[in-house]
């Protein structure tokens, strides 16, 4: 089955610049299929823009200005690229790549979409580092004692743009765990978001990862925030036990960012 | 020109209670096209649900049922037993792939229908309230409550900033919420919640110790704070973006 990945969840540009949006095709040979590009402007219907067929033929939707969009494909990397020239306010949209999934019977084909790339146009001069800055929260003793479960919370702050994806995994597993999250909130010129994961007591001794995808992550790779295992023997300790210099001291894992 | 028009912009559904989405075609006969349904969830992921000729996306066949009403020129998508995972925007789209003609392989979309999922009506449940802390940051975790109306107070005399709470459906079909804030006196911050004509405190859930009154304003009686845990990390907490870490004991 064909699968589409759009590695950029967002692409931030200033007016009149060129945006290049990538779509990586897997599970099917890119040279043997057509790749389609759609856009969804805020409040408008999703609209077909342009496609490139298996033989390299490019088709544009009528009414799309010529020279605005360019589409190509690179078989070596199994990638299709949509280039948007001279970006302007009306180009603000989410751009999806798509393909008809190769099934034997023509009438049984389905069109699958990539996860989309949001084109953001800004006139702001942003700080050097507008990647998400993490703070971790470990489960409270009260929760682990009373509910035999623990909640990890991953707070991400001071990022721009607002497009961000967060998911959770156990350290040595690729399974995405069921988590919950708040809305992305504006704080001055940047954004913040938090996500939380509640795990049963038996999973508290495992390491968990909060995985964050953002346009401005360092080196363009997903950021992994590691949540250390919680020792269950600590959870069930007598509350009067001293496990640090002072029973009222807090053990804090303070994640602090500095920028060069 | 062909146009696909959803019946509603927003459809609230209750967990487990069947719901029907409708999408009518203007300007053409629906029978001349194949109808598709997609769902866009948080994070913009567009997932294929259904295409005419009884084609369903992975995991959708058991809980969704697509149909065409030729007489009324509309497409129908039934969600048989909605769950919180079914929240999102639903799009109908049409194509003529396999019917011949030019440029038939593009999809023409209608506007989305936003499906919001609510827990089904149930006995009222009092929340559990827990506080989590890191530096000046404080999070109030409010678990498993019903109904949704709630007021979360992070109680402090030295507030730096507070954020609106996130209220979401819990896996068990009730509600969970988190409220975050930053406080100079984070060690003494407690959380109190007003819900269903009662006030519930994070201190109600603390492990009881001998306690004396605090001398700071608006604080709780218990000197033990809920997230003053002695959790010992087995591994260094590391992250791509973090280049300085302090362990405060």
């Amino acid at each position: 089955a064909g699968h589409l990945e759009q590695p950029q969840i967002s692409s931030t540009k200033t007016l009149s610049k060129t945006a290049r949006l990538e779509c990586v095709v897997s599970g099917i040979t890119i040279s043997a299929t057509s790749v389609y590009w759609y856009r969804e402007r805020p409040g408008e219907v999703i609209q077909f823009l342009v496609s490139i067929s298996y033989d390299g033929t490019v088709r544009k939707e009528s009414g799309i200005p010529s020279g605005k969009f360019e589409v190509d494909r690179i078989p070596e990397t199994s990638t299709s690229t949509l280039t948007i020239h001279n970006v302007e306010k009306q180009d603000i949209a989410t751009y999806y790549c798509a393909l008809w999934e190769a099934q034997q019977e023509l009438g049984k084909k389905i069109k699958v979409f990539g996860p989309g790339t949001k084109l953001i146009i800004t006139d702001k001069q942003l700080d050097a580092d507008v990647s998400p800055k993490p703070t971790i929260f470990l489960p409270s003793i009260a929760e682990t004692k009373l509910q035999k479960a623990g909640t990890y919370l991953c707070l991400l702050e001071k990022f721009f743009p607002d497009v961000i994806k967060i998911h959770w995994q156990e350290k040595k597993s690729n399974t995405i765990l069921g988590s919950q999250e708040g809305n992305t909130m504006k704080t001055n010129d940047t954004y913040m978001k938090f996500s939380w994961l509640t795990v049963p007591e038996k999973s508290l001794d495992k390491e968990h990862r909060c995985i964050v995808r953002h346009e401005n992550n360092k080196n363009g790779v997903d950021q992994e925030i590691i949540f250390p295992p919680i020792k269950t023997d600590v959870i069930t300790m007598d509350p009067k036990d001293n496990c640090s210099k002072d029973a009222n001291d807090t053990l804090l894992l303070q994640l602090t960012n500095t920028s060069a | 020109a062909i146009e696909l028009v959803p019946e509603h912009q927003t459809v609230p559904v209750s967990i487990g209670v069947p719901a029907t989405l409708r999408c009518s075609m203007k300007g053409e006969a629906i029978g001349n096209y194949y109808i598709n349904w997609y769902r866009k969830t948080q994070g913009n992921t567009m997932t294929f649900i259904y295409r005419e000729k009884d084609i369903y996306g992975p995991g959708f066949k058991d809980n969704f049922q697509g149909d065409i009403d030729i007489a009324k020129n509309l497409a129908v998508l039934k969600i048989l037993a909605p769950s919180e995972r079914d929240e999102g925007s639903y799009y109908c789209a049409c194509d003529t792939l396999g019917m011949g003609g030019e440029y038939t392989d593009k999809l023409i979309f209608g506007k989305g229908t936003r499906v919001t999922v609510e827990p089904r009506s149930q006995p009222h449940t009092k929340p559990s309230v827990f506080v989590m802390k890191n530096g000046t940051n404080v999070a109030c975790l409010v678990k498993e409550f019903y109904p949704k109306d709630i007021r979360i107070n992070l109680v402090s005399s030295k507030k730096i900033t507070e954020f609106d709470p996130a209220i979401v459906i819990s896996p068990s079909g009730k509600y969970n919420a988190v409220k975050l804030g930053k406080y100079e006196d984070s060690n003494s911050v407690t959380c109190s919640v007003q819900h269903d004509n009662k006030t519930v405190h994070s201190t109600d859930f603390e492990v009881k110790t001998d306690s004396t009154d605090h001398v700071k304003p608006k604080e709780t009686e218990n000197t033990k704070q809920p997230s003053k845990s002695c959790h010992k990390p087995k591994a260094i907490v590391h992250t791509e973006k973090v280049n300085m870490m302090s362990l405060t004991v």
Partner: antibody, heavy 121, light 108 residues
């Protein structure tokens, strides 16, 4: 009928101590959070302290922190305010008030008639 | 700390007249505002909560409005028993109930 009756107000010297009581009737005291609010002569109302129904949470205004202690005895249907290190500025009528929650809205629906505390040498 | 101000300090009106009392918060309190009435020698009496909801037993001639920082208490036609001091109170930073300084409605 809901009734709250404060007592214990009197004349006390600066630096002295006093214990106010509030006897309640007409409702299940152990189910309600309670507050003390005061009013200096000719002045407006000032919230003083809060206690939750089971006494797990107690909150105080900045002006009384460290000097006043709120407590309750649910078995005796009584609310108390222990006032130490009294100052002239503590001179006021002290009201106890029941806190009700209307769905999620805290309101002070029921008040006592007040007891007068005068701090003077 | 949120500071509440009320205006005017005193309102001199005759029975049957309309009274409009104003309350302003130093920062937004959303709709977390209540109004109380107090007569000499008596305890305060709750009139309005959530800016516009009448408490039990409060007559329809008394109404509240506003949100954010500006609020109004209106008595459409003053009755003799309405002459009293009126306090507004914010509850957004519960449990700290902050009261305004009060508006005295007196007989002209």
């Amino acid at each position: 009928e809901v009734q709250l009756v404060e007592s214990g107000g009197t004349l006390v010297q600066p630096g002295g101590s006093l214990r106010l009581s509030c006897a309640v009737s007409g409702f299940t005291f152990s189910s309600y959070d309670m507050n003390w609010v005061r009013q200096a002569p000719g002045k407006g109302l000032e919230w003083v302290s809060y206690i939750s129904s089971s006494s797990t949470a107690k909150y105080y205004a900045d002006s009384v922190k460290g000097r006043f202690t709120i407590s309750r005895d649910n078995a005796k249907n009584s609310l108390y305010l222990q006032m130490n290190s009294l100052w002239d500025e503590d001179t006021a009528v002290y009201y106890c008030a029941r806190e009700d929650i209307v769905v999620v809205t805290p309101i002070l629906q029921h008040w006592g008639q007040g007891t007068t505390v005068t701090v003077s040498s | 700390e949120i500071v509440m101000t009320q205006s005017p300090a005193t309102l001199s009106l005759s029975p049957g007249e309309r009274a409009i009392l104003s309350c302003r918060a130093s920062q937004s309190v959303s709709k977390d505002l209540a109004w109380y009435q107090q007569k000499p020698g008596q305890a305060p009496r709750l009139l309005i909560y959530d800016a516009s909801n009448r408490a039990t037993g409060i007559p329809a001639r008394i109404s509240g409005s506003g949100s954010g920082t500006d609020f109004t208490l209106t008595i459409s036609s003053l009755e003799p028993e309405d002459f009293a001091v009126y306090y507004c109170q914010q509850r957004i930073n519960w449990p700290l109930f902050t009261f305004g300084p009060g508006t005295k409605v007196e007989i002209k």
